[in-house]
Amino acid sequence: KNLKSPQKVEVDIIDDNFILRWNRSDESVGNVTFSFDYQKTGMDNWIKLSGCQNITSTKCNFSSLKLNVYEEIKLRIRAEKENTSSWYEVDSFTPFRKAQIGPPEVHLEAEDKAIVIHISPGTKDSVMWALDGLSFTYSLVIWKNSSGVEERIENIYSRHKIYKLSPETTYCLKVKAALLTSWKIGVYSPVHCIKTTVENELPPPENIEVSVQNQNYVLKWDYTYANMTFQVQWLHAFLKRNPGNHLYKWKQIPDCENVKTTQCVFPQNVFQKGIYLLRVQASDGNNTSFWSEEIKFDTEIQAFLLPPVFNIRSLSDSFHIYIGAPKQSGNTPVIQDYPLIYEIIFWENTSNAERKIIEKKTDVTVPNLKPLTVYCVKARAHTMDEKLNKSSVFSDAVCEKTKPGNTSK
């Protein structure tokens, strides 16, 4: 009896694991084995596929074959008993195109109100993703074990910290990788759970802000208790992307070590151009807080996010405000090549009641003013990038009197 060729061959590639699955064409015939050959692009001869010769099951692994993952490959299979079936040719494919990203490895650390997530590619030193190691981004789904209400967090890197959690609570999460450059989304890791600790005696510092004064950066934060000492550390933001080494060498800012106030001043030249993460920790001599939330700090934006300059055209019932580029020393305008939004605050000179307008435009109307009344205006700029979320300081207040009635035209 002639043996039939096997059918429905499927190639599954996850990271560096190459698996073949197929259907037996004739279940009634026993003791059949299967063998594969492969052929590279531009070659005429077929080569035996090691790991997939004389297989008795309907699955084999050819991960040991050192292939160029960007090169097209063709496979063929046949059944063997006393005689052999005809070859069944599988559609040619490129391993890299066919490959899926496997589940990443996840390592969790708990604090009282935060969880640190360290993510590594599932296959260490993967051949498949050798050129893409630094391009991986991750997304995760996290939920309280008790409620199951899921929150999704997209576009994170190999280290991510989730804040504002509840103490003594078990959180569960799963993570998947993506290679956005190749339109590949990976499969989720197994679910990992961790319990946050009992609440710490000392809370971490909050509301960290950086501003520029003269040639210095001024770092300010809020703290609940008095008589504390603080230290500030920085890290290059790009190091959060490092997929291999989960050692983060946070650096001390010398002028911000053991400071007794909720601010510290340090020279701008401490940082070269770049994006950094900053964090602050409090200590009372016996106990230490956990680190504050890490804030992103871009020297380019920080240095040049100066308060806006504006002119006011006064009418009887409104002001027209024209916002221009801020001036550097030497009266040259600063070119700001990132989108900004403007916060304009105005108030009647004789009152403390402030009103606020948020505008993307550089010409703004402040409506509903009273004639012949002095109003004061100040403005500041904000970046529109959620992640950087930087603000300039407010400009000096400018006060103007509205015109008499009927001059609004």
Partner: antibody
Framework: EVQLQQSGAEVVKPGASVKLSCTAS????????MHWVKQRTEQGLECIGR????????KYVPKFQGKATITAETSSNTAYLQLSSLTAEDTAVYYC???????????WGQGTSVTVSS | DVVMTQSRKFMSTSVGDRVSVTCKAS??????VAWYQQKLGQSPKALIY???YRYSGVPDRFTGSGSGTDFTLTISNVQSEDLAEYFC?????????FGGGTKLEIK
């Protein structure tokens, strides 16, 4: 294979100084922290300090500030511990270790015995 | 500095038994605790990090648990080669302090 090879045992006089070395192979010390740890006979482990060989930044346990100086030479992939004004209290085995992922001291040298005796 | 206290200086156990070595931190250190094993005349060796993660090559009879201030290293099915001293260490805040050690004796 990752290895940390420490210099040989030292017998020194009180008041003198000694410099211990720790040469790494199988990895680049610039990518890690290098720690020094003290262990007195029948006693526990005590951190002395650490260095980031990439930029030379050091951190000392306050108790060892002024007593210990940690340096590193990236060209020879070596970390050093210098101990000054030695007293009998400094008689101990000194270990270098690598600070790796998650701050674990994942590899240790074989230890260097320092005996302070007149 | 954070003080790490290992209250039992010595523990006695038999081959095949299960034994738990405990460690208490003077303040909340999250899960930033590692465990090391030191056999007589040898250098310490990393066993557990981040409170519960086993270091590569460490047999799965070694298990770490705990968070906040209370941590435990459990050795199930104790083997004769587990005769050693065990140290905990916190790496939540500098200096990274060690516990005083617990010597495990095999009966």
């Amino acid at each position: 294979e990752v290895q940390l090879q420490q210099s040989g045992a030292e017998v020194v006089k009180p008041g003198a100084s000694v410099k211990l070395s720790c040469t790494a192979s199988g990895f680049n010390i610039k990518d890690y922290y290098m720690h020094w740890v003290k262990q007195r006979t029948e006693q526990g482990l005590e951190c002395i300090g650490r260095i980031d060989p990439e930029d030379g930044e050091t951190k000392y346990v306050p108790k060892f500030q002024g007593k210990a100086t940690i340096t590193a030479e990236t060209s020879s992939n070596t970390a050093y511990l210098q101990l000054s004004s030695l007293t009998a209290e400094d008689t101990a085995v000194y270990y270098c270790s690598r600070g790796g992922s998650y701050y674990v001291m994942d590899y240790w040298g074989q230890g260097t015995s320092v005996t302070v005796s007149s | 500095d954070v003080v790490m206290t290992q209250s039992r200086k010595f523990m006695s156990t038999s081959v095949g038994d299960r034994v738990s070595v405990t460690c208490k931190a003077s303040q909340n250190v999250g899960t930033s605790v590692a465990w090391y094993q030191q056999k007589l005349g040898q250098s310490p060796k990393a066993l557990i990090y981040s409170a519960s993660y086993r270091y590569s090559g460490v047999p799965d009879r070694f298990t770490g648990s705990g968070s906040g201030t209370d941590f435990t290293l459990t050795i199930s099915n104790v083997q004769s080669e587990d005769l050693a001293e065990y140290f905990c260490q916190q790496d939540n805040s500098y200096p990274h302090t060690f516990g005083g050690g617990t010597k495990l004796e095999i009966k």
